[in-house]
């Protein structure tokens, strides 16, 4: 009779195992084992005992001892079962990024591993289990579906394999797959508002304003902002499920035209947008020319308003006939126009706007100077001791100097407050000097005496 | 029956060669393991180094690596052990033995005597 | 290296005692473990190999027993041929290594 120890091994791949082949009888004619695996004999004095290393078992095998004694042959054949973890643990790749509410289907790949019998695979969120299953068929392959939540955001999902040789006397074996981070999002299907001048002028700042409300988790959001392929660099405030995007926007000569403002909002694999057209003008203010802005009174002054071939312009309230971007007045310079104001309104059409724009020339008129009896009077009679201030204005541009003086020296302190003496009668040759000439006027002071009672 | 005979022991000085020789019979070197295990003078028993004929792998003790080497030689069905660079603690009876983990058969040894 | 270490290193005993000698290995060596007997003058004997197993042509009054790291090699009845050095091996792991081995001396 022959037997085997140990009739039953577990072993890791590639291992090697002691088989103790022996008969029952004394002095066997054959005693030895058959098998594939590279065999060594550990000798042991005796005729009915022989122990084989087998090395190298890469699968299940099942080595059979024989011995050949008088009373005949017989067998016995040792059980050897390989264990060994599996080669490739992996969850399907999927985007990182899932919509809330959408079912998102785990799909986990199982290469190798045996023996299968004690092969599990596990698909895991966190250290909770979604489903397990025993590994079957090569690669082994399970799938679940999650519905995906808010709070799943950031949750790890992942794949482990239990390879339990427990029952064996062995331990339990793990592999884990790489995890793969769930990052749950909400956009949602309104696409953002956008709040910004419809018309902007070359050469100006415009302050854009772009927001959208219900996003989660809104710190992940992306705002682009570009006016045409100008990108701009908005300052994002964030709410709860909100944010708000600000920036300014700054045009050029070589932006003038229809632009579009675009603002899209990227989470997670989704975007949304809004689109805006801005006008970009130039609309410079208006041209007003004088022929001269200072002439001499009597000249001849013609007014010019001048502005954009498309804007229609009123020069000091009168528009221009016919209604177009350029109008004109003649007029005869009088003391009166001097600090006149002359004063052109352009108006512009953008974009269903209508743009006003003002240009302002003042007239100088140069005449002069004057001497008038109602701002000069030629004749002053004052009781002495009074207090009394001389008054006498001299007109004309530029304003002219005036001087009064009695006997060529003795100056009227034109404008003072003075004490009324006998020496202040006289007649005063009062003289108005500018750059226009001069002229004189006489002005005589009369002094009363009191009258003693 | 299962025999292994040592040879090739002597006096060397510090420093020399020795090479020893097992001759086996009663089995095929090739289909097990051969092993030297020494024994100095008045002391136990210390294991040296290991080979399988079948594939000339090696395995030595700390104490002869890169000095001694293990050899065999499936056609004269016998073991050498190659010993270099001989020191005074190598003095010892060198015994070669049978088996894989354990030593079932030994043979008479060999005394190895390293002195000026 | 794993290091052997046998208690006692020598014992006095009158034939027909029980002996029992004891090997400690410095971290667990399941049942890689053997015994040897060997006279002076002698190659060593096997004994006993795997902790237990007995070998043919060795007479049943010497066994073997433990696991992991504390084994025992029992002399049922001392016999005049059994005085001798005893020695202990494991081999679990390299470098083999021998115990200090322990001498049966005639009380």
């Known amino acids: 009779q022959t037997s085997v120890s140990p009739s039953k091994v577990i072993l890791p791949r590639g291992g090697s195992v002691l088989v103790t082949c022996s008969t029952s009888c004394d002095q066997p004619k054959l005693l030895g084992i058959e098998t594939p695996l590279p065999k060594k004999e550990l000798l042991l004095p005796g005729n009915n005992r022989k122990v084989y290393e087998l090395s190298n078992v890469q699968e299940d095998s099942q080595p059979m001892c024989y011995s050949n004694c008088p009373d005949g042959q017989s067998t016995a054949k040792t059980f050897l079962t390989v264990y060994w973890t599996p080669e490739r643990v992996e969850l399907a790749p999927l985007p990182s990024w899932q919509p809330v509410g959408k079912n998102l289907t785990l799909r986990c790949q199982v290469e190798g591993g045996a023996p299968r019998a004690n092969l599990t695979v596990v698909l895991l969120r966190g250290e909770k289990e979604l489903k397990r299953e025993p590994a079957v068929g090569e690669p082994a392959e399970v799938t679940t579906t999650v519905l995906v939540r808010r709070d799943h955001h950031g949750a790890n999902f992942s794949c482990r394999t239990e390879l339990d040789l427990r029952p064996q006397g062995l331990e339990l074996f793990e592999n884990t797959s790489a995890p793969y981070q769930l990052q749950t999002f909400v956009l949602p299907a309104t696409p953002p508002q956008l709040v910004s001048p419809r018309v902007l002028e070359v050469d100006t700042q415009g302050t854009v304003v772009c927001s959208l409300d219900g996003l989660f988790p809104v710190s992940e959001a992306q705002v682009h902002l570009a006016l045409g392929d100008q990108r701009l660099n908005p300052t994002v405030t964030y709410g709860n499920d909100s944010f708000s995007a600000k920036a300014s926007v700054s045009v050029t000569a070589e932006d003038e035209g229809t632009q579009r403002l675009t603002c899209a909002v990227i989470l997670g694999n989704q975007s949304q947008e809004t689109l805006q057209t801005v006008t970009i003008y130039s609309f410079p203010a208006p041209n007003v020319i004088l022929t001269k802005p200072e002439v001499s009174e009597g000249t001849e002054v013609t007014v010019k308003c001048e502005a954009h071939p498309r804007a229609k312009v009123t020069l000091n309230g009168v528009p221009a006939q016919p209604l177009g971007p350029r109008a004109q007045l003649l007029l005869k310079a009088t003391p009166e126009d001097n600090g006149r104001s002359f004063s052109c309104s352009a108006t512009l059409e953008v974009a269903g706007q209508l743009i006003h724009k003002n240009q302002t020339r003042e007239l100088r008129v140069l005449y002069g100077p004057r001497l008038d009896e109602r701002d000069c009077p030629g004749n002053w009679t004052w009781p002495e001791n009074s207090q009394q201030t001389p008054m006498c204005q001299a007109w004309g541009n530029p304003l002219p100097e005036l001087k009064c003086l009695k006997d060529g020296t003795f100056p009227l302190p034109i404008g003072e407050s003075v004490t009324v003496t006998r020496d202040l009668e006289g007649t005063y040759l009062c003289r108005a000097r500018s750059t226009q000439g001069e002229v004189t006027r006489k002005v005589t002071v009369n002094v009363l005496s009191p009258r003693y009672e | 029956e299962v025999q292994l005979v040592e040879s090739g022991g002597g006096l060397v000085q510090p420093g020399g060669s020795l090479r020893l020789s097992c001759a086996a019979s009663g089995f095929n070197i090739k289909d097990t393991y051969i092993h030297w295990v020494r024994q100095a003078p008045g002391k136990g028993l210390e294991w040296v180094a290991r080979i399988d004929p079948a594939n000339d792998n090696t395995i030595y003790a700390d104490s002869v690596k890169g000095r001694f080497t293990i050899s065999g030689d499936d056609s004269k069905n016998t073991a050498y052990l190659q010993m270099n660079s001989l020191r005074a603690e190598d003095t010892a009876v060198y015994y070669c033995?049978?088996?894989?983990?354990?030593?079932?058969?030994w043979g008479q040894g060999t005394l190895v005597t390293v002195s000026s | 290296d794993i290091q052997m270490t046998q208690s006692p290193s020598s014992l006095s005993a009158s034939v027909g005692d029980r002996v029992t000698i004891t090997c400690r290995a410095s971290q667990s060596i399941s049942n890689n473990l053997h015994w040897y007997q060997q006279k002076p003058g002698k190659a060593p004997k096997l004994l006993i190999y795997?902790?237990?197993q007995s070998i043919s042509g060795v007479p049943s009054r010497f066994s073997g027993s433990g696991s992991g790291t504390d084994f025992t090699l029992t002399i049922s009845s001392l016999q005049p041929e059994d005085f001798a050095t005893y020695y202990c091996?494991?081999?679990?792991?390299?470098?083999?290594?021998f115990g200090q081995g322990t001498k049966v001396e005639i009380k």
């Open positions: 795997h902790a237990s």
């Open positions: 033995t049978t088996s894989g983990y354990w030593f079932a058969y």
């Open positions: 091996q494991q081999s679990n792991s390299w470098p083999y290594t």
